[in-house]
């Protein structure tokens, strides 16, 4: 049973390592993948010193984690590398970190990227 | 630390019901999916059951749908797998399994026993 | 129905290096099916040994490693010990909510 499925057909594309992995650095990345597998978009992003550092933005292979996500929400307690997915076109272009600890109210800190 | 534990287990009739129960701890079950794996005595793991981190998308292997029905209470930590019309090839050890990303099974329940005979 | 094979048995003598292979009857194995493998002993949970193909999961020793041999994923485990007697098993994920289990393989390690 799947209830209120959103497709996934392109994310906003972002690599901070452009010139290195020779790709664009920035625009949008249609999903390709096998007609029985659902699409999702991600983010990942580092936290220097309050700063945020973009690494990459993009789409993601079937993954069952991201699934109902329509949102791009991090939710893990001061993870390395921030991460989120998400399933709806272009649903990457916002991301946030709201850590859900066991027992202490969550805080919400948005981020709308400007790569 | 993260903690599944497994219960409802049991001895059943065939065509009987169980429901199984797996109590999360150690992480923020609502942002996990979570899945139901089996072990028959002296066979090898059969994937059974997958279920969305909202609940909204399960999923069930062919021999089990229409039969069993996985379901979670996120206010509760708590994940079910509701099992009717139990079969004699239904007696296993049931193994609750949190899912990470990529799709694998990152922790283990210690497993609840299901025997299905009359 | 996807039928996802893994060797019956294998031996490994101490300090060897054994690869156990895990392929499918729909055709090659790739990265995009994120093989993971289990350790299991028995009348114990299994273990995570390595997901996405070849990331090793946390405590997980550097002698198994996983990675894409040919059309199937593999587990090698370099410099085998006593207590690596155990079942092994892959996992794919099929996308939309199926995963399948290989059959496992019962490694002994002689001596």
């Known amino acids: 049973a799947i209830l209120g499925r959103s497709e996934t057909q392109e994310c906003l594309f972002f690599n901070a390592n452009w010139e290195k992995d020779r790709t664009n650095q920035t625009g949008v990345e249609p999903c390709y993948g096998d007609k029985d597998k659902r699409r999702h978009c991600f983010a990942t992003w580092k936290n220097i010193s309050g700063s945020i550092e973009i690494v990459k933005q993009g789409c993601w292979l079937d993954d069952i984690n991201c699934y109902d996500r329509t949102d791009c929400v991090e939710k893990k307690d001061s993870p390395e590398v921030y991460f989120c997915c998400c399933e709806g076109n272009m649903c990457n272009e916002k991301f946030s970190y709201f850590p859900e600890m066991e027992v202490t109210q969550p805080t919400s800190n948005p981020v709308t990227p400007k790569p | 630390e993260v903690q599944l534990l497994e219960s409802g287990g049991g001895l059943v009739q065939p065509g009987g019901s169980l429901r199984l129960s797996c109590a999360a701890s150690?992480?923020?079950?609502?942002?996990?999916?979570m899945s139901w794996v089996r072990q028959a005595p002296g066979k090898g793991l059969e994937w059974v059951s997958g279920?969305?981190?909202?609940?909204?998308?399960?999923f069930y292997t062919d021999s089990v749908k229409g039969r069993f029905t996985v379901s979670r209470d996120n206010s509760r930590n708590t994940l079910y797998l509701q099992m009717n019309s139990l079969r004699a090839e239904d007696t296993a050890v049931y193994y609750c399994?949190?899912?990470?990303?990529?799709?694998?099974?990152?922790?283990w329940g210690q497993g609840t026993l299901v025997t299905v005979s009359s | 129905q996807t039928v996802v094979t893994q060797e019956p048995s294998f031996s490994v003598s101490p300090g060897g290096t054994v690869t156990l292979t895990c392929g499918f009857n729909?055709?090659?194995?790739?990265?995009?099916?994120?093989p993971s493998w289990y350790q299991q002993t028995p009348g114990q949970a299994p273990r995570t040994l390595i997901y996405?193909?070849?990331t090793r999961s946390s405590g997980v020793p550097d002698r198994f490693s996983g990675s894409i041999l040919g059309n199937k994923a593999a587990l090698t485990i370099t410099g085998a010990q006593a207590d690596d007697e155990s079942d092994y098993y892959c996992?794919?994920?099929?996308?939309?909510?199926?995963?399948?289990f290989g059959g496992g393989t019962k490694l002994t390690v002689l001596g």
């Open positions: 996405n193909t070849n």
């Open positions: 150690g992480f923020t079950f609502r942002n996990s999916a």
């Open positions: 399994a949190k899912v990470y990303y990529y799709s694998f099974f990152d922790y």
């Open positions: 996992v794919l994920w099929m996308g939309s909510g199926i995963w399948v």
């Open positions: 729909s055709g090659s194995v790739s990265t995009s099916y994120w």
């Open positions: 279920i969305s981190v909202t609940g909204g998308s399960t």
